[in-house]
């Protein structure tokens, strides 16, 4: 008698390695002899692809060589005429032992950047993935973490983080290890000693001495006056990492001493700078107890930076203040050339600004430091990039002994302006009063406005308070 | 996790001295400018004092200015507030809190995170 | 001293309601505002920095608006953990200051 299909061995889930052989049985009981069609993932499987054989009247698929793309759900449908066709479905779950499609490769990386080793896996279970670094497994913390790819990505890289590294991917079914690379840390150029400033007599002899260090060992030159030191000897010695300088000096004019600390990182140098006055006793009559005096600015580098007929701090603790500072400046604004176009009219302001402070008069003149604000703007916004470089070259801390040897103020070491409105200085080129911020200004013109974001109005500031728009 | 604890308060006679402390941790201590805000009981908020990261700047609010002295001791990640020649109406819960820049680098947030506060009861 | 006001004093609501507060300064600050949510025996809690930004983890039904020396704080949909008191606090210059706060209770 005419018998409808009925399907009498469900398909089951079927675990398959990469490579080997799949089987689907469909056992159907039915009179006259059924129909059996497959369908993966609800596409017809063609009787004549080669890739599977279809036996015992269709009851039987065998995937012949197992792929990873192979996986998903396999169907078969019987029909016969008697009745409606039935279906069974099973699924395909493709295994394979892990693999390392993307190997970490080898990496020279400058101390304090990120470093990202990849390690991109295939298989199935997913493998876990984890490092060794020389012949222990390493250990994540704070800093370093294997990213949910496999990558190892480590934060604020340091010298102790060199080393020879390989991942490794484990599953179920194996492990698989990459070749072992190398991360390679270089460090910028820092000086570790400056050399210090002296106040001596006609004639004297004086031993500037400057230490610094870096990966590379850095080589150190001296700048007097903002030229290559014409007189004097120099002695060098390196040792550990460090390199030791002394330029012996026979004094018969004040001078600015500058040591240069230069290493090569590829293609691009870091250089650290330190210097020091020279002063000549009976050429500097500073006003007792005072560190400096108000004057208006003289100089040409910052002219289109500072307010016009700016009242600007001059430090007497070097011997020709305003020839100083301009050279501090010049020597500056020369680093400045390499910086992005974005930064460089902002860092160029700050640095004016710094150098050359706004100044107080009153019986003890005083310098007015730029509002902390205005230097986060810079650093954060505007010199992102630039500015762990520009931070590697200058002396650490705010003033270092009491001269403003600065390239780059400390920020936190700043006033907030939302303390003391009158208490520190504005950049004036910056219109904080607005919020959709893009670029600073060139510096052309005496005082151009631009959009930046708003920080805190003053009563006494000389800056117009226009409406605030929140950033998006 | 970023926590701050007070402690030093207690009752104390008008005319006498206070000293409270506050402990932080789970943050760089050292990078932060702290501030004292206190809550007089069934009160509004005060501010206090303020203090930078470096110590630096410091201000108070008039109403305790000469009395008052905040300190910070970044070794040990610690606030202290004195409170001398204390008065009836300087009886508060007494908090410390953090300031901080928010993720631009240079907008400031207020009072970020604060203590649980501890009580100083100035009475005869 | 800029001196903050905060109106009303007392709000009284239900859940779900749309509830605004306002703070006046007496003098422009920008938008050197801050919001705080403080609930009995707890320290404030910062919800809103610089008058419309909204603080790291607090629900996106609050927000805040204004600048100069008129500002608000709205709460799209009260929720039960919103009944609590609300300070505004001017943060443009020392001595910086709070409004007297505004309590919101359930109807």
């Known amino acids: 008698l005419p018998k409808a299909p009925v399907i009498t061995t469900p398909l089951e889930t079927v675990d398959a390695l990469v490579e080997e052989v799949a089987t689907f049985m469909c056992a159907v009981e039915s009179y006259p002899q059924p129909e059996i069609s497959w369908t993966r993932n609800k596409i017809l499987i063609k009787l004549f692809d080669t890739r599977y054989s279809i036996r015992e009247n269709g009851q039987l698929l065998t995937i012949l060589s197992v792929e990873d793309s192979d996986d998903g759900i396999y169907c078969c449908t019987a029909n016969n005429g008697v009745g409606g066709a039935v279906e069974s479905c099973g699924a395909l779950q493709v295994k394979m032992k892990p693999k390392i499609t993307r190997p970490p490769i080898n990496v020279k990386i400058i101390e304090g950047l990120k470093a990202v080793l990849p390690c991109t896996t295939m298989g199935n279970p997913k493998p876990s993935v984890s490092w060794i670094k020389g012949d222990s497994p390493l250990r994540e913390n704070s800093r370093i973490a294997v990213l949910e790819s496999g990558s190892l990505r480590i934060h604020n890289v340091q010298k102790e983080d060199a080393g020879q590294y390989r991942c490794v991917a484990k599953n179920s079914l194996g492990t698989a290890y990459s070749k072992v690379v190398k991360l390679e840390v270089e460090v910028f150029a820092r000086i570790l000693r400056a050399p210090e400033s002296h106040n001596v007599t006609f004639g004297s002899f004086v031993t500037l001495h400057c230490t610094a260090t870096g990966i590379p060992v850095p080589t150190i030159t001296w700048i007097e006056n903002g030229n290559a030191v014409s007189s004097g000897s120099i002695q060098e010695s390196v040792k550990d990492r460090v390199i030791d300088s002394r330029l012996q000096l026979f004094i018969t004019k004040p001078g600015l001493y500058t040591c240069i600390a230069t290493n090569k990182h590829g293609e691009k140098f870091s250089t650290a700078k330190a210097a020091a006055t020279i002063s000549i006793a009976e050429w500097s009559k500073p006003q007792k107890d005072n560190k400096g005096y108000c004057a208006q600015y003289r100089g040409e580098v910052c002219n289109a930076v500072l307010a016009k007929d700016a009242l600007v701090f001059l430090n007497t603790s070097y011997a020709d203040p305003e020839e100083a500072q301009e050279l501090l400046v010049h020597t500056a604004w020369n680093e400045l050339k390499v910086v992005s176009p974005v930064c460089r009219p902002a860092a160029e302001a700050l640095l004016c600004n710094h150098i050359f402070q706004e100044c107080s008069p009153g019986v003890v003149p005083t310098p007015i430091p730029i509002c902390r604000e205005y230097c986060l703007a810079v650093k954060e916004l505007f010199c992102a990039k630039e500015w762990l470089v520009m931070e590697e070259k200058t002396h650490r801390g705010l003033y270092r002994s009491e001269m403003h040897l600065l390239s780059v103020p400390e920020c936190s070491k700043l006033p907030s302006m939302h303390w003391d409105p009158t208490a520190c200085a504005r950049l004036p080129h910056l219109d904080y009063n607005k919020e959709n911020l893009k670029t600073f200004p060139p510096m052309t013109s005496s005082k151009p406005s631009v959009d930046i974001p708003n920080l805190p109005s003053s009563s006494s500031s000389s800056f117009s308070v226009s409406p605030t728009y929140s950033m998006t | 996790e970023v926590q701050l604890v007070e402690s030093g308060g207690g009752l104390v006679k008008p005319g006498g001295s206070l000293r409270l402390s506050c402990a932080a941790s789970?943050?760089?201590?050292?990078?932060?400018?702290m501030n004292w805000v206190r809550q007089a009981p069934g009160k509004g908020l005060e501010w206090v004092s303020s203090i930078s990261s470096s110590s630096s700047y410091i201000y108070y609010a008039d109403s305790v200015k000469g009395r008052f002295t905040i300190s910070r001791d970044n070794a040990k990640n610690s606030l202290y507030l004195q409170m001398n020649s204390l008065r009836a109406e300087d009886t508060a819960v007494y908090y410390c809190?953090?300031?901080?820049?928010?993720?631009?680098?240079?907008?400031?947030?207020?009072?970020?995170?604060w203590g649980q506060g501890t009580l100083v009861t100035v009475s005869s | 001293d800029i001196q903050m006001t905060q109106s009303p004093s007392t709000l009284s609501a239900s859940v779900g309601d749309r509830v605004t507060i306002t703070c006046r300064a007496s003098?422009?600050?920008?938008?050197?505002l801050a919001w705080y949510q403080q609930k009995p025996g707890k320290a404030p809690k910062l919800l809103i920095y610089k008058a419309s930004s909204l603080e790291s983890g607090v629900p996106s039904r609050f927000s805040g608006s204004g600048s100069g020396t008129e500002f608000i704080l709205t709460i799209s949909s009260l929720q039960p953990d919103d009944f609590a008191t609300y300070y505004c606090q001017q943060y443009n210059s020392h001595s910086w200051t709070f409004g007297q706060g505004t309590k919101v209770e359930i109807k």
């Open positions: 789970g943050f760089t201590f050292s990078s932060y400018d």
């Open positions: 003098q422009s600050i920008d938008n050197w």
């Open positions: 809190a953090r300031d901080s820049y928010d993720s631009s680098g240079y907008y400031l947030r207020p009072f970020d995170y």
